[in-house]
């Protein structure tokens, strides 16, 4: 997250970190069910661990943390690397979470976002770009949903209805390491960090997010079919 600020503790209990060995964060994710996460499809890896209820990026033990393995990864059937359409994936955890103030699911919004809606994006991704500098703790950033026309103007021929753009002033954006993390609007999960320009936070080049309102049926049916 570029030019965000430290999230208040316990305010993002659905935020997960996807980790490679040794404790290497590569993506964020979102708890949407006691045993299921949503993340970006481009975050698919064979072997990874899931950390929930953790505030700092470092692997130091925190009393609220819960660690899991991903036992099943189900990317949306319409996703095709290296494209960005349908960029979402469900991950089944090896067991159900223990609900606490630090670990709690969030509901996926069934309403599509309108331009001007104020949202919050969070993650442990780099805070500088193109340099790489990681934060000590989870970062939060207020962003506004942009109209689809502004989104298409920013990225000609690259935007479809499975995506929406959101940003703020130049210099504020999600970035590498934030993929799969939550965009929360009006208390519901509206999007996932997906892609954007490089370097991050360039003027008139907003972040692009997976438009989850288009996928509520797929999410529900996939969880039911695999539970």
């Amino acid at each position: 997250i570029i030019n965000g600020s430290d999230c208040d503790m316990h305010t993002q209990p659905w935020q997960a970190a996807l980790l490679l060995r040794p404790n290497q964060l590569y993506c964020g994710a979102v708890l949407v069910h006691p045993q299921w996460l949503l993340t970006a499809a481009h975050c698919r890896k064979k072997v990874f661990r899931v950390r929930l209820g953790h505030y700092s990026l470092s692997p130091v033990y925190e009393s609220g943390q819960q660690m899991f393995q991903g036992v099943k990864s189900i990317p949306h059937p319409g996703y095709s690397h290296p494209g960005h359409s349908n960029d979402l994936m469900l991950i089944k955890l090896n067991r159900r979470i223990r609900p606490t103030k630090d670990v709690r699911p969030i509901n996926v919004s069934s309403h599509c976002p309108s331009a001007g809606t104020k949202c919050l994006v969070s993650g442990w991704g780099t805070t500088k770009s193109p340099q790489v500098h990681f934060p000590k703790v989870l970062q939060c950033l207020n962003i506004s949903v942009l109209s689809q026309k502004r989104c298409e103007d920013a990225y000609p021929r690259q935007i479809d209805d499975t995506m929406f753009c959101a940003g703020d002033k130049a210099g504020r954006d999600s970035c590498q390491g934030d993929s799969g993390g939550p965009v929360v609007c009006n208390g519901s999960l509206q999007g996932l960090v997906s892609w954007g320009d490089y370097p991050c936070a360039r003027p008139n080049r907003p972040g692009v997010y997976t438009n989850l309102c288009k996928f509520t049926k797929w999410i529900q049916e996939t969880i039911q079919a695999n539970s």
């Epitope: 991704g125 799969g180 892609w195």
Partner: antibody
Framework: EVQLVESGGGLVQPGGSLRLSCAAS????????MNWVRQAPGKGLEWVSY????????DYADSVKGRFTISRDNAKNSLYLQMNSLRAEDTAVYYC???????????????????WGQGTTVTVSS | DIQMTQSPSSVSASVGDRVTITCRAS??????LAWYQQKPGKAPKLLIY???SLQSGVPSRFSGSGSGTDFTLTISSLQPEDFATYYC?????????FGGGTKVEIK
């Protein structure tokens, strides 16, 4: 078949210019960042330049900064390297290489260069 | 710039031998290291990315390990087609830099 084909190499005098081209086929060129890498006779690999998929980020090795310019034309599936003020030490085989890391995607994961051309030889000599 | 130091610069080995090549970065690069194989007159070929992930189509006798500053490429049982030069490369930080190469020769 995924393929990169370089062209434009040749013999040039010190101080001269050349423009290398790299034609891409078999993949969606506009989705990938690209690199130029060179190899002097009997030496190792040296990274020369990088360009992101949308051309929004470009970088160069210090040894070529200010003399070489990387560019791309996504509509033509082509990558270019304009080389000016050439020196004897620029003599090398020049490879274009696809970067498997998508810098547009916002995961923190880096791959490497997975597709390489056959190379084109640049000789700088009087 | 990050310096990548490979050792040894050359190694003589026989078919069936286990060969280990090391690469050291001048500063930590997490797991973001790639290994390439290059045969004379040919372009390099990506073998391993992210320090230990095998590129599609690469035989399983090749393996990589390491994190931070120290990395290893291992060929568990050398085959005739493995005689080549091997390079490591750090990929997270510009300028990208390669190691000096390790030539694997027939003993």
């Amino acid at each position: 078949e995924v393929q990169l084909v370089e062209s434009g190499g040749g013999l040039v005098q010190p101080g001269g210019s050349l423009r290398l081209s790299c034609a891409a086929s078999g993949f969606t060129f506009e989705h990938y960042s690209m690199n130029w890498v060179r190899q002097a006779p009997g030496k190792g690999l040296e990274w020369v330049s990088y360009i992101s998929s949308s051309s929004s980020y470009i970088d160069y090795a210090d040894s070529v900064k200010g003399r070489f310019t990387i560019s791309r034309d996504n509509a033509k599936n082509s990558l270019y390297l304009q080389m000016n003020s050439l020196r004897a030490e620029d003599t090398a085989v020049y490879y274009c290489a696809r970067d498997l890391t998508s810098m547009q995607s916002r995961d923190y994961y880096y791959y490497g260069m997975d597709v390489w051309g056959q190379g084109t030889t640049v000789t700088v000599s009087s | 710039d990050i310096q990548m130091t490979q050792s040894p610069s050359s190694v003589s080995a026989s078919v069936g031998d286990r060969v280990t090549i090391t690469c050291r970065a001048s500063q930590g690069i997490s797991s973001w290291l790639a290994w390439y194989q290059q045969k004379p007159g040919k372009a390099p070929k990506l073998l391993i990315y992210a320090a230990s992930s095998l590129q599609s189509g690469v035989p399983s006798r090749f393996s990589g390990s390491g994190s931070g500053t120290d990395f290893t490429l291992t060929i568990s049982s050398l085959q005739p087609e493995d005689f080549a030069t091997y390079y490591c490369q750090q990929v997270p930080i510009f300028p990208y830099t390669f190691g000096g190469g390790t030539k694997v020769e027939i003993k």
